[in-house]
């Protein structure tokens, strides 16, 4: 389990010809909000899938009223992160769909009207626990700048949030802010605990007890909007509403490792690899002899009888580093087949197999596809305790006998064409119609009464889902 987080930094007119001055129509003021949709996988053939990893809707942004003489600005945005919780494993590869909606606040029959301003679809690879990824995307004449990351929520850890970790009370040699894990992984996991009261929305920490602010926020707990900001080179002024850009300096900036140690970033923190003769979180401890017991995890110390002669640690299987302080992640080689869960016990690896599989590496299949038929070009896949069919695109159900085309129900009215795009169904309306399902006739004056709920678009706009 974990959370996908999206931070919108700016939304405004893009460069180049045809850049709009205002997101609002001539009918008066409007405000923006965003919708994010996550789908697993990168495949173009995943057209039918809903937002299987989850979706989220932002709060409404501040009201925007166009100033006729003013330059086209970055638009006022909703505060805070968009967070999409996911229950299962983080897939690593995913499609990210961000929609920018406007809510028109002028005199509307039946209340406010919503319409889709822009939509970007990104297919990405991302490991959970990694740093913020930044992106700039154009959608038509608009430009959207945003950052995103996926993070696990305890007890889940790892790049896919599939390994389980629970705190133990026994003392350990884990560094400050890190806790040992149980049941079987004897390793130090978990993100640092930030200073008490540090803003969840506008603050973050890379060391335990600190509170660092996202650009655009200040104060000891990152609760005070900053009046001005450089926005790390982003176009336009910063404002308290934009949240601006994400953490600037990385944890290894300025190399926190002393005495020639080399720094590598880890999720939410850093790790120093120390030269011989030094150890500690930042390689700050020197003058160490074997008598000081510098070799962790049962490592054997050789030499180093006095402070001037270097010692050498001979590490037991499963550990490495100049002080045997690092666990070798033997599970990263994915030795368990057929979706088995890898457990590194230190002295050995163990695979916990999914139902239907057995063997030291879950290599034996207990199911049998013999005599099982999958219709419409589907193929039988063994596993999960019973046979299942992997269906050809356009079919679904246990035996691939059901039509799974998102366009099968003919959702696009009045002769509109439905396309099974990887990001979801897309309607292309016949001339003279508009709306999310081409349901509204375009009036002779080129406008149509839109429903008072999303999605409704300008005439001639594609309909996107």
């Amino acid at each position: 389990a974990g959370v996908f987080e999206l931070q919108i930094h700016s939304f405004g007119p893009g460069p180049g010809p045809g850049a709009p001055r205002s997101p609002c129509s001539a009918r008066g003021p409007c405000r923006l909000f965003f919708r994010v949709c996550l789908k697993p996988g990168l495949s173009e053939e995943a057209a039918e899938s809903p937002c299987a990893l989850g979706a989220a809707l932002s709060a409404r942004g501040p009201v925007y009223t166009e100033q006729p003489e003013a330059p086209a600005p970055d638009l006022p945005l909703p505060n805070g992160l968009l967070q999409v919780p996911f229950r299962d494993a983080w897939p690593g590869t995913f499609s990210l769909i961000i929609e920018t909606w406007r809510e028109e606040l002028g005199d509307q029959i039946g209340g406010p009207a919503w319409s889709l301003l822009a939509r970007v679809t990104r297919r990405r690879r991302l490991a959970a626990g990694g740093p913020w990824a930044r992106d700039i995307q154009r959608a038509g004449a608009w430009e959207l700048r945003f950052s995103y990351r996926a993070r696990c929520e305890l007890p889940a850890v790892g790049t896919a949030c599939t390994r389980l970790c629970r705190p133990r009370s026994a003392p350990s040699r884990c560094g400050p802010g890190l806790r040992p894990c149980a049941p079987l992984e004897d390793e130090c996991e978990a993100p640092p605990v930030c200073r008490a009261g540090c803003s969840l929305e506008h603050g973050f920490c890379e060391q335990p007890g600190e509170c660092r602010c996202l650009e655009g926020w200040t104060g000891p707990l990152c609760t005070v909007p900053a009046s001005t900001s450089s926005c790390l080179g982003l176009r336009g002024p910063s404002s308290a509403t934009t949240g601006c850009l994400v953490p600037g300096p990385g944890p290894c900036d300025g190399n926190p490792c002393a005495n020639g140690g080399s720094c590598s970033e880890t999720p939410g923190s850093f790790e120093c690899t120390c030269p011989r003769g030094f150890y500690g979180l930042r390689c700050e401890v020197s003058g160490v002899t074997c008598a000081d017991g510098p070799c962790f995890n049962g490592g054997l110390c050789v030499g180093g009888a006095d402070p001037d002669s270097a010692y050498i640690c001979h590490c037991p299987p499963g550990f490495q580093g100049s002080n045997c302080e690092k666990r070798v992640d033997r599970c990263s080689l994915q030795p368990c087949r057929n979706g088995g869960l890898c457990l590194d016990l230190g002295h050995a690896l163990r695979c916990r197999c999914r139902a239907g599989f057995a063997g030291p590496r879950c290599e034996h299949n207990l199911d049998d596809c013999a005599g099982r038929a999958c219709a419409n070009g589907g193929t039988c896949v063994e596993g999960g305790g019973a046979h299942r069919c992997s269906c050809a695109l356009g079919f679904g159900g246990r035996d691939c006998r059901e039509r799974a085309d998102p366009c099968a129900a003919r959702p696009c009215a009045h002769g509109g064409r439905c396309y099974a795009h990887f990001s979801g169904l897309v309607c292309a309306c016949a001339p003279g119609y508009m709306g999310s399902r081409c349901e509204f006739p375009v009036h002779p004056d080129g406008v149509s009464a839109l429903p008072a709920a999303p999605p409704g678009l300008r005439p001639g706009d594609p309909q996107r889902h």
Partner: antibody, heavy 119, light 110 residues
């Protein structure tokens, strides 16, 4: 593996009808696409000829192609075909089949087949 | 008939140069952004670079970018590389289920 492959005669005589076939694999026409034909004369640019929409098998053609081009589908063979009547030397080109799945772009192309019109 | 006009039709540039190709349509494309860009090398089918005016197709280097809406669009190659020598085409989709291609821009490396 999602693929398209064009096939047909490499040489056609003037005034004859050219028939080309596009065989697809890795996807099913039960989903909704535009399957299109695009041609490219030697040393020239790309030219859209027409498409067939698999949702209802309706066809659309470039204005120059109306009356000369017919596109059809044979779902049982995972094929769709192009017929171009009354060919002349100006129809000598590489002919591509391509698939559109939304937002107006052809995301999947065949390798193309060269057709020469000559007596 | 709808016309898509690309300019220039030919350009010669050095490795590392920033290259811009424009595409102008006689009619607005569907939804204002249903325009795509392709790269074609001799003997190969076109390869999709950009769709929906500005979305980079997966696997395409980030030095390629697209912008524009309605009738005016631009393809930019930020830092030209030797492998970018090819012909580039814009292609629009229009109301009434009509497609059209631009005339192409041949990019040569100096």
């Amino acid at each position: 593996q999602v693929t398209l492959r064009e096939s047909g005669p490499a040489l056609v005589k003037p005034t004859q009808t050219l028939t080309l076939t596009c065989t697809f694999s890795g996807f099913s026409l039960s989903s909704s696409y535009d399957m299109g034909w695009v041609r490219q004369a030697p040393g020239q640019g790309l030219e859209w000829m027409g498409t067939i929409y698999t949702g209802d098998y309706s066809t659309d053609y470039a204005s120059w192609a109306k009356g000369r081009v017919t596109i059809s589908v044979d779902t049982s063979k995972n094929q769709f075909s192009l017929k171009l009547s009354s060919v002349t030397a100006a129809d000598t080109a590489v002919y591509y089949c391509a698939r559109h799945t939304g937002y107006g772009y052809f995301g999947l192309w065949g390798q193309g087949t060269l057709v020469t019109v000559s007596s | 008939d709808i016309q898509l006009t690309q300019s220039p039709s030919f350009l010669s540039a050095s490795v590392g140069d920033r290259v811009t190709i424009t595409c102008q349509s006689t009619e607005s494309v569907y939804g204002s952004d249903w325009l795509s860009w392709y790269q074609q090398k001799p003997g190969q089918p076109p390869k999709l670079l950009i769709y929906q005016a500005s979305n980079l197709e997966i696997g395409v280097p980030s030095r390629f970018s697209g912008s524009g809406s309605g009738t005016d669009f631009t393809l930019t190659i930020n830092s030209l590389e030797a492998e970018d020598a090819a012909t580039y085409y814009c292609q629009g989709y229009y109301s009434g289920y009509i497609y059209a291609f631009g005339g192409g821009t041949k990019v040569e490396i100096k």
